[in-house]
Interface confidence: low
Protein backbone atom coordinates (compact mmCIF):
# COMPACT_ATOMS: atom_id res chain seq x y z
CA UNK A 1 0.00 0.00 0.00
CA UNK A 2 0.99 3.64 -0.43
CA UNK A 3 1.71 5.64 2.68
CA UNK A 4 -0.35 8.73 3.44
CA UNK A 5 2.50 11.06 2.56
CA UNK A 6 2.45 9.46 -0.93
CA UNK A 7 6.20 9.03 -0.96
CA UNK A 8 6.61 5.31 -0.44
CA UNK A 9 4.77 2.31 -1.79
CA UNK A 10 4.95 -0.36 0.92
CA UNK A 11 4.57 -3.94 -0.15
CA UNK A 12 3.97 -6.43 2.65
CA UNK A 13 4.88 -9.96 1.70
CA UNK A 14 3.78 -12.98 3.70
CA UNK A 15 5.34 -16.24 2.64
CA UNK A 16 3.29 -19.39 2.26
CA UNK A 17 6.46 -21.29 3.09
CA UNK A 18 7.14 -19.80 6.53
CA UNK A 19 8.55 -23.01 7.96
CA UNK A 20 10.83 -23.54 5.00
CA UNK A 21 12.35 -20.07 5.21
CA UNK A 22 12.48 -20.12 9.00
CA UNK A 23 15.16 -22.80 8.81
CA UNK A 24 17.35 -21.01 6.26
CA UNK A 25 18.87 -17.61 5.78
CA UNK A 26 17.03 -15.89 3.00
CA UNK A 27 16.90 -12.54 1.24
CA UNK A 28 13.91 -10.95 -0.43
CA UNK A 29 14.06 -8.33 -3.15
CA UNK A 30 11.24 -6.60 -4.97
CA UNK A 31 11.78 -5.93 -8.65
CA UNK A 32 9.61 -3.18 -10.08
CA UNK A 33 9.30 -1.08 -13.17
CA UNK A 34 7.63 2.29 -13.59
CA UNK A 35 5.58 2.95 -16.70
CA UNK A 36 7.82 5.47 -18.43
CA UNK A 37 10.21 2.60 -19.26
CA UNK A 38 7.38 0.71 -20.95
CA UNK A 39 6.29 3.33 -23.46
CA UNK A 40 8.37 2.08 -26.37
CA UNK A 41 8.79 -1.52 -25.32
CA UNK A 42 6.79 -4.76 -25.37
CA UNK A 43 4.06 -5.49 -22.78
CA UNK A 44 6.51 -7.57 -20.75
CA UNK A 45 9.44 -5.32 -19.86
CA UNK A 46 13.00 -6.39 -20.38
CA UNK A 47 14.89 -7.77 -17.41
CA UNK A 48 17.30 -4.86 -17.36
CA UNK A 49 14.54 -2.27 -17.06
CA UNK A 50 13.54 -3.36 -13.55
CA UNK A 51 14.64 -1.48 -10.47
CA UNK A 52 15.37 -3.57 -7.39
CA UNK A 53 14.83 -2.84 -3.69
CA UNK A 54 15.84 -4.93 -0.72
CA UNK A 55 12.99 -5.98 1.57
CA UNK A 56 13.17 -5.93 5.34
CA UNK A 57 11.89 -9.29 6.56
CA UNK A 58 12.05 -8.74 10.30
CA UNK A 59 8.55 -7.29 10.49
CA UNK A 60 5.79 -9.56 11.93
CA UNK A 61 6.88 -12.53 9.80
CA UNK A 62 6.25 -10.31 6.78
CA UNK A 63 8.60 -8.48 4.50
CA UNK A 64 8.39 -4.73 4.01
CA UNK A 65 9.50 -3.46 0.62
CA UNK A 66 9.70 0.31 0.07
CA UNK A 67 9.17 1.52 -3.50
CA UNK A 68 9.52 5.23 -4.30
CA UNK A 69 6.56 6.25 -6.48
CA UNK A 70 6.42 9.82 -7.87
CA UNK A 71 3.09 11.54 -7.23
CA UNK A 72 2.65 12.10 -10.95
CA UNK A 73 2.69 8.34 -11.49
CA UNK A 74 0.05 7.37 -8.93
CA UNK A 75 -2.51 6.62 -11.63
CA UNK A 76 -0.13 4.54 -13.72
CA UNK A 77 0.47 0.83 -13.51
CA UNK A 78 3.32 -0.48 -11.40
CA UNK A 79 4.69 -3.88 -12.44
CA UNK A 80 6.57 -5.89 -9.87
CA UNK A 81 7.70 -9.31 -8.82
CA UNK A 82 9.43 -10.84 -5.81
CA UNK A 83 12.81 -12.51 -5.82
CA UNK A 84 13.59 -14.74 -2.85
CA UNK A 85 17.09 -16.17 -2.42
CA UNK A 86 17.47 -18.99 0.09
CA UNK A 87 20.15 -21.67 0.42
CA UNK A 88 21.54 -20.88 -3.00
CA UNK A 89 18.12 -21.30 -4.64
CA UNK A 90 16.25 -18.39 -6.26
CA UNK A 91 12.46 -18.27 -6.18
CA UNK A 92 10.70 -15.70 -8.31
CA UNK A 93 7.01 -14.77 -8.15
CA UNK A 94 4.82 -14.15 -11.18
CA UNK A 95 4.60 -10.59 -12.46
CA UNK A 96 2.06 -8.50 -10.56
CA UNK A 97 0.50 -5.20 -11.57
CA UNK A 98 -1.05 -2.58 -9.31
CA UNK A 99 -2.19 1.01 -9.60
CA UNK A 100 -0.70 2.88 -6.64
CA UNK A 101 -3.66 5.28 -6.58
CA UNK A 102 -5.87 2.31 -5.68
CA UNK A 103 -3.63 1.32 -2.80
CA UNK A 104 -3.34 4.57 -0.87
CA UNK A 105 -3.58 4.24 2.89
CA UNK A 106 -4.22 7.77 4.16
CA UNK A 107 -2.91 9.07 7.43
CA UNK A 108 -5.55 9.07 10.18
CA UNK A 109 -7.91 12.06 10.32
CA UNK A 110 -6.76 14.89 12.55
CA UNK A 111 -8.23 17.17 15.19
CA UNK A 112 -11.06 14.96 16.41
CA UNK A 113 -13.41 17.19 18.37
CA UNK A 114 -16.76 16.79 20.15
CA UNK A 115 -19.25 19.35 21.38
CA UNK A 116 -22.89 19.65 22.38
CA UNK A 117 -24.86 21.80 19.95
CA UNK A 118 -27.45 24.37 20.96
CA UNK A 119 -30.24 21.87 20.30
CA UNK A 120 -28.66 19.21 22.51
CA UNK A 121 -27.05 16.97 19.89
CA UNK A 122 -23.47 15.68 19.95
CA UNK A 123 -21.41 17.03 17.07
CA UNK A 124 -18.31 15.06 16.16
CA UNK A 125 -15.90 16.81 13.79
CA UNK A 126 -12.41 16.22 12.44
CA UNK A 127 -10.00 17.33 9.71
CA UNK A 128 -8.91 15.48 6.62
CA UNK A 129 -5.27 14.38 6.71
CA UNK A 130 -2.93 16.47 4.54
CA UNK A 131 -1.47 15.42 1.18
CA UNK A 132 -4.32 13.09 0.20
CA UNK A 133 -4.86 13.39 -3.57
CA UNK A 134 -8.61 12.63 -3.54
CA UNK A 135 -11.72 13.09 -1.38
CA UNK A 136 -12.11 10.64 1.49
CA UNK A 137 -14.97 8.80 3.09
CA UNK A 138 -14.83 8.40 6.83
CA UNK A 139 -15.87 5.69 9.22
CA UNK A 140 -16.88 7.05 12.59
CA UNK A 141 -16.86 4.51 15.39
CA UNK A 142 -18.32 5.52 18.70
CA UNK A 143 -19.40 3.80 21.86
CA UNK A 144 -21.90 5.08 24.37
CA UNK A 145 -21.07 4.09 27.92
CA UNK A 146 -23.78 4.57 30.51
CA UNK A 147 -23.07 2.94 33.88
CA UNK A 148 -23.05 -0.79 33.09
CA UNK A 149 -24.16 -0.49 29.48
CA UNK A 150 -21.90 -0.07 26.49
CA UNK A 151 -23.39 0.38 23.04
CA UNK A 152 -21.33 0.66 19.90
CA UNK A 153 -22.13 2.10 16.51
CA UNK A 154 -20.38 3.14 13.37
CA UNK A 155 -21.31 5.23 10.38
CA UNK A 156 -19.73 5.92 7.00
CA UNK A 157 -19.86 9.58 5.96
CA UNK A 158 -18.21 11.75 3.31
CA UNK A 159 -18.36 14.95 5.39
CA UNK A 160 -15.86 15.79 8.11
CA UNK A 161 -18.51 15.92 10.81
CA UNK A 162 -21.32 13.81 12.17
CA UNK A 163 -24.29 14.78 14.30
CA UNK A 164 -25.48 12.25 16.87
CA UNK A 165 -28.89 13.01 18.29
CA UNK A 166 -30.81 11.33 21.11
CA UNK A 167 -27.71 11.35 23.27
CA UNK A 168 -27.90 10.09 26.83
CA UNK A 169 -27.25 12.37 29.79
CA UNK A 170 -24.49 11.31 32.15
CA UNK A 171 -22.86 9.10 29.56
CA UNK A 172 -19.41 9.03 28.03
CA UNK A 173 -18.90 8.77 24.29
CA UNK A 174 -15.63 7.39 22.97
CA UNK A 175 -15.04 8.26 19.33
CA UNK A 176 -12.52 7.27 16.67
CA UNK A 177 -12.41 8.08 12.96
CA UNK A 178 -10.57 6.61 10.01
CA UNK A 179 -10.52 7.49 6.31
CA UNK A 180 -10.43 5.84 2.91
CA UNK A 181 -10.70 6.98 -0.69
CA UNK A 182 -14.28 8.02 -1.45
CA UNK A 183 -14.73 7.25 -5.13
CA UNK A 184 -12.62 4.19 -5.76
CA UNK A 185 -10.56 1.41 -4.26
CA UNK A 186 -8.37 2.19 -1.32
CA UNK A 187 -7.17 1.11 2.11
CA UNK A 188 -8.59 2.34 5.39
CA UNK A 189 -6.25 4.51 7.41
CA UNK A 190 -5.41 3.57 10.95
CA UNK A 191 -7.95 4.76 13.50
CA UNK A 192 -7.41 8.20 14.95
CA UNK A 193 -6.48 8.44 18.62
CA UNK A 194 -9.68 7.86 20.63
CA UNK A 195 -11.34 10.87 22.22
CA UNK A 196 -13.84 10.71 25.08
CA UNK A 197 -16.66 13.15 25.73
CA UNK A 198 -18.90 12.97 28.77
CA UNK A 199 -22.40 14.43 28.70
CA UNK A 200 -23.74 16.19 31.77
CA UNK A 201 -26.12 14.44 34.11
CA UNK A 202 -29.67 15.75 34.19
Amino acid sequence: WLKGDLKLFICYVESLFKNLFRNYNYKVHLLYVLPEVLEDSPLVPQKGSFQMVHCNCSVHECCECLVPVPTAKLNDTLLMCLKITSGGVIFQSPLMSVQPINMVKPDPPLGLHMEITDDGNLKISWSSPPLVPFPLQYQVKYSENSTTVIREADKIVSATSLLVDSILPGSSYEVQVRGKRLDGPGIWSDWSTPRVFTTQDV
Epitope: T148, V149, A153, D154, V164, S166, G170
Partner: antibody
Protein backbone atom coordinates in the same frame (compact mmCIF):
# COMPACT_ATOMS: atom_id res chain seq x y z
CA UNK B 1 -41.74 17.95 10.23
CA UNK B 2 -40.91 14.33 11.01
CA UNK B 3 -43.77 12.09 9.89
CA UNK B 4 -44.49 8.37 9.57
CA UNK B 5 -47.56 7.13 7.71
CA UNK B 6 -48.55 3.45 7.70
CA UNK B 7 -50.70 1.78 5.04
CA UNK B 8 -51.67 -1.68 3.85
CA UNK B 9 -53.88 -2.82 6.70
CA UNK B 10 -57.23 -4.51 6.20
CA UNK B 11 -59.25 -7.65 6.79
CA UNK B 12 -57.56 -10.91 5.88
CA UNK B 13 -58.33 -14.59 6.44
CA UNK B 14 -56.14 -16.77 8.67
CA UNK B 15 -53.22 -18.27 6.79
CA UNK B 16 -53.15 -15.47 4.21
CA UNK B 17 -50.56 -12.72 3.74
CA UNK B 18 -50.47 -8.95 3.97
CA UNK B 19 -47.79 -6.34 3.41
CA UNK B 20 -47.66 -3.18 5.45
CA UNK B 21 -45.81 -0.05 4.38
CA UNK B 22 -44.57 2.96 6.30
CA UNK B 23 -43.71 6.16 4.43
CA UNK B 24 -41.21 8.40 6.20
CA UNK B 25 -40.63 12.11 5.65
CA UNK B 26 -39.00 15.07 7.33
CA UNK B 27 -35.76 13.34 8.33
CA UNK B 28 -32.84 11.42 6.87
CA UNK B 29 -34.50 8.02 6.82
CA UNK B 30 -31.37 6.11 5.86
CA UNK B 31 -29.64 6.88 9.16
CA UNK B 32 -32.30 5.57 11.54
CA UNK B 33 -33.24 2.16 12.86
CA UNK B 34 -36.96 1.48 12.38
CA UNK B 35 -39.45 -0.67 14.29
CA UNK B 36 -42.89 -2.19 14.01
CA UNK B 37 -44.93 -2.26 17.21
CA UNK B 38 -48.48 -3.59 17.45
CA UNK B 39 -51.42 -3.23 19.78
CA UNK B 40 -54.27 -5.73 19.90
CA UNK B 41 -57.72 -4.19 20.55
CA UNK B 42 -57.97 -3.11 24.18
CA UNK B 43 -54.50 -4.49 24.98
CA UNK B 44 -51.01 -3.13 25.59
CA UNK B 45 -48.09 -2.49 23.26
CA UNK B 46 -46.11 -5.38 21.80
CA UNK B 47 -42.85 -4.92 19.96
CA UNK B 48 -42.79 -6.84 16.66
CA UNK B 49 -39.57 -6.19 14.74
CA UNK B 50 -36.63 -3.86 14.17
CA UNK B 51 -34.34 -3.19 11.21
CA UNK B 52 -31.08 -1.26 11.48
CA UNK B 53 -30.41 1.80 9.35
CA UNK B 54 -28.34 -0.17 6.82
CA UNK B 55 -30.38 -3.42 6.88
CA UNK B 56 -27.46 -5.27 8.45
CA UNK B 57 -29.50 -6.27 11.51
CA UNK B 58 -33.09 -7.49 11.71
CA UNK B 59 -34.76 -8.86 14.81
CA UNK B 60 -38.22 -10.26 15.51
CA UNK B 61 -40.42 -11.06 18.47
CA UNK B 62 -40.75 -14.80 19.06
CA UNK B 63 -44.48 -14.57 18.28
CA UNK B 64 -43.83 -13.56 14.65
CA UNK B 65 -40.44 -15.16 13.94
CA UNK B 66 -40.47 -17.15 10.71
CA UNK B 67 -43.73 -15.58 9.56
CA UNK B 68 -42.99 -11.86 9.35
CA UNK B 69 -40.20 -10.15 7.41
CA UNK B 70 -39.08 -6.58 7.93
CA UNK B 71 -37.36 -4.66 5.13
CA UNK B 72 -36.69 -1.12 4.03
CA UNK B 73 -35.94 0.85 0.90
CA UNK B 74 -33.81 3.83 1.82
CA UNK B 75 -34.08 5.28 -1.68
CA UNK B 76 -37.87 5.47 -1.22
CA UNK B 77 -37.84 6.39 2.49
CA UNK B 78 -40.02 3.35 3.09
CA UNK B 79 -40.29 0.61 5.70
CA UNK B 80 -42.17 -2.64 5.10
CA UNK B 81 -43.55 -5.57 7.05
CA UNK B 82 -44.40 -8.69 5.07
CA UNK B 83 -46.80 -10.78 7.15
CA UNK B 84 -47.35 -14.39 6.10
CA UNK B 85 -49.36 -17.22 7.67
CA UNK B 86 -51.47 -14.74 9.58
CA UNK B 87 -53.26 -15.87 12.71
CA UNK B 88 -56.25 -14.50 14.63
CA UNK B 89 -53.91 -13.31 17.36
CA UNK B 90 -52.11 -11.06 14.85
CA UNK B 91 -55.17 -8.81 14.82
CA UNK B 92 -53.91 -5.41 15.98
CA UNK B 93 -53.11 -1.87 15.07
CA UNK B 94 -49.59 -1.88 13.63
CA UNK B 95 -47.40 1.16 14.21
CA UNK B 96 -44.07 1.98 12.67
CA UNK B 97 -41.72 3.94 14.90
CA UNK B 98 -38.31 5.52 14.52
CA UNK B 99 -35.39 4.54 16.71
CA UNK B 100 -32.10 6.24 17.40
CA UNK B 101 -29.73 6.92 14.52
CA UNK B 102 -26.55 5.33 13.19
CA UNK B 103 -26.73 1.78 14.36
CA UNK B 104 -27.73 2.47 17.96
CA UNK B 105 -30.68 0.17 17.53
CA UNK B 106 -33.08 -0.52 20.42
CA UNK B 107 -33.13 2.89 22.01
CA UNK B 108 -36.51 4.54 22.22
CA UNK B 109 -39.40 5.11 19.82
CA UNK B 110 -40.00 8.63 18.56
CA UNK B 111 -42.04 9.46 16.62
CA UNK B 112 -44.73 6.88 15.87
CA UNK B 113 -47.01 6.64 12.87
CA UNK B 114 -50.78 6.83 13.27
CA UNK B 115 -51.11 3.06 12.87
CA UNK B 116 -52.89 0.75 10.45
CA UNK B 117 -55.43 -1.86 11.55
CA UNK B 118 -54.94 -5.49 10.56
CA UNK B 119 -57.89 -7.78 11.22
CA UNK B 120 -57.37 -11.51 10.80
CA UNK B 121 -60.74 -13.22 10.66
CA UNK B 122 -62.49 -15.95 8.74
CA UNK C 1 -36.48 -11.81 28.42
CA UNK C 2 -36.74 -8.90 30.81
CA UNK C 3 -40.25 -8.51 32.22
CA UNK C 4 -41.61 -5.04 32.98
CA UNK C 5 -44.33 -4.68 35.63
CA UNK C 6 -46.24 -1.46 36.08
CA UNK C 7 -48.31 -0.46 39.08
CA UNK C 8 -51.02 0.38 39.53
CA UNK C 9 -52.82 -1.02 36.49
CA UNK C 10 -55.27 1.85 36.74
CA UNK C 11 -55.78 4.83 38.98
CA UNK C 12 -58.25 7.67 39.41
CA UNK C 13 -57.08 11.19 40.16
CA UNK C 14 -58.27 14.77 39.96
CA UNK C 15 -56.94 17.77 38.09
CA UNK C 16 -54.12 19.33 40.12
CA UNK C 17 -53.18 16.05 41.84
CA UNK C 18 -49.64 14.75 42.01
CA UNK C 19 -49.54 11.30 40.45
CA UNK C 20 -46.83 8.64 40.56
CA UNK C 21 -46.69 5.52 38.40
CA UNK C 22 -44.05 2.87 39.07
CA UNK C 23 -42.34 0.39 36.80
CA UNK C 24 -40.24 -2.54 37.95
CA UNK C 25 -37.85 -4.55 35.79
CA UNK C 26 -37.19 -8.25 36.41
CA UNK C 27 -33.45 -7.49 36.36
CA UNK C 28 -31.26 -4.40 36.41
CA UNK C 29 -31.65 -2.28 33.29
CA UNK C 30 -29.41 0.61 34.39
CA UNK C 31 -31.12 3.77 33.12
CA UNK C 32 -32.49 2.28 29.89
CA UNK C 33 -36.12 2.94 30.69
CA UNK C 34 -38.54 5.04 28.63
CA UNK C 35 -42.08 6.27 29.29
CA UNK C 36 -44.88 6.76 26.74
CA UNK C 37 -48.31 8.33 26.88
CA UNK C 38 -51.15 7.01 24.73
CA UNK C 39 -54.58 8.55 24.33
CA UNK C 40 -57.55 6.55 22.98
CA UNK C 41 -57.34 6.05 19.20
CA UNK C 42 -53.93 7.71 19.00
CA UNK C 43 -50.35 6.54 18.67
CA UNK C 44 -48.11 6.49 21.74
CA UNK C 45 -45.95 9.53 22.41
CA UNK C 46 -42.50 9.50 24.00
CA UNK C 47 -42.42 11.43 27.29
CA UNK C 48 -39.23 10.40 29.09
CA UNK C 49 -36.16 8.59 27.81
CA UNK C 50 -33.16 7.21 29.67
CA UNK C 51 -35.19 7.13 32.90
CA UNK C 52 -35.10 10.85 33.57
CA UNK C 53 -34.59 12.85 30.37
CA UNK C 54 -37.60 14.88 29.27
CA UNK C 55 -38.34 14.53 25.56
CA UNK C 56 -38.41 17.81 23.65
CA UNK C 57 -41.84 19.45 23.71
CA UNK C 58 -43.09 17.51 26.75
CA UNK C 59 -44.37 19.71 29.62
CA UNK C 60 -42.08 19.98 32.63
CA UNK C 61 -44.76 18.66 34.99
CA UNK C 62 -43.69 15.21 33.76
CA UNK C 63 -40.56 13.78 35.34
CA UNK C 64 -38.89 10.41 35.59
CA UNK C 65 -36.53 8.89 38.09
CA UNK C 66 -34.97 5.60 39.06
CA UNK C 67 -32.15 3.29 38.09
CA UNK C 68 -31.51 -0.43 38.15
CA UNK C 69 -34.88 -2.14 38.62
CA UNK C 70 -37.24 0.49 40.07
CA UNK C 71 -38.49 3.52 38.18
CA UNK C 72 -41.18 6.15 38.60
CA UNK C 73 -43.06 8.54 36.36
CA UNK C 74 -44.40 11.56 38.21
CA UNK C 75 -46.94 14.12 37.04
CA UNK C 76 -46.58 17.02 39.47
CA UNK C 77 -49.93 18.69 38.80
CA UNK C 78 -52.38 16.72 36.72
CA UNK C 79 -53.97 18.54 33.77
CA UNK C 80 -57.13 17.50 31.88
CA UNK C 81 -55.06 16.45 28.83
CA UNK C 82 -52.98 14.07 30.95
CA UNK C 83 -55.72 11.47 31.35
CA UNK C 84 -54.40 8.63 29.21
CA UNK C 85 -52.62 5.28 29.42
CA UNK C 86 -48.92 5.27 30.31
CA UNK C 87 -46.40 2.60 29.33
CA UNK C 88 -42.84 1.97 30.43
CA UNK C 89 -40.39 0.25 28.07
CA UNK C 90 -36.92 -1.17 28.60
CA UNK C 91 -34.19 -0.80 26.00
CA UNK C 92 -31.37 -2.42 27.94
CA UNK C 93 -31.44 -6.06 26.90
CA UNK C 94 -32.78 -6.24 23.41
CA UNK C 95 -34.19 -7.77 21.38
CA UNK C 96 -36.87 -8.29 22.38
CA UNK C 97 -37.88 -4.83 23.48
CA UNK C 98 -40.44 -5.15 26.26
CA UNK C 99 -43.17 -2.85 27.54
CA UNK C 100 -45.01 -2.73 30.80
CA UNK C 101 -48.68 -3.70 30.67
CA UNK C 102 -49.78 -0.07 30.96
CA UNK C 103 -51.32 2.16 33.62
CA UNK C 104 -54.67 3.72 32.84
CA UNK C 105 -55.07 7.15 34.42
CA UNK C 106 -58.73 8.17 34.77
CA UNK C 107 -60.54 11.24 36.02
CA UNK C 108 -61.92 10.80 39.55
Amino acid sequence: QVQLVESGGGVVQPGRSLRLSCAASGFTFSTYGMHWVRQAPGKGLEWVSVISYDESNKYYADSVKGRFTISRDNSKNALYLQMNSLRNEDTAVYYCARDRPFGLVTGWFDPWGQGTLVTVSS
Amino acid sequence: DIQMTQSPSSLSASVGDRVTITCRASQSISSYLNWYQQKPGKAPKLLIYAASSLQSGVPSRFSGSGSGTDFTLTISSLQPEDFATYYCQQSYSTPPITFGQGTRLEIK
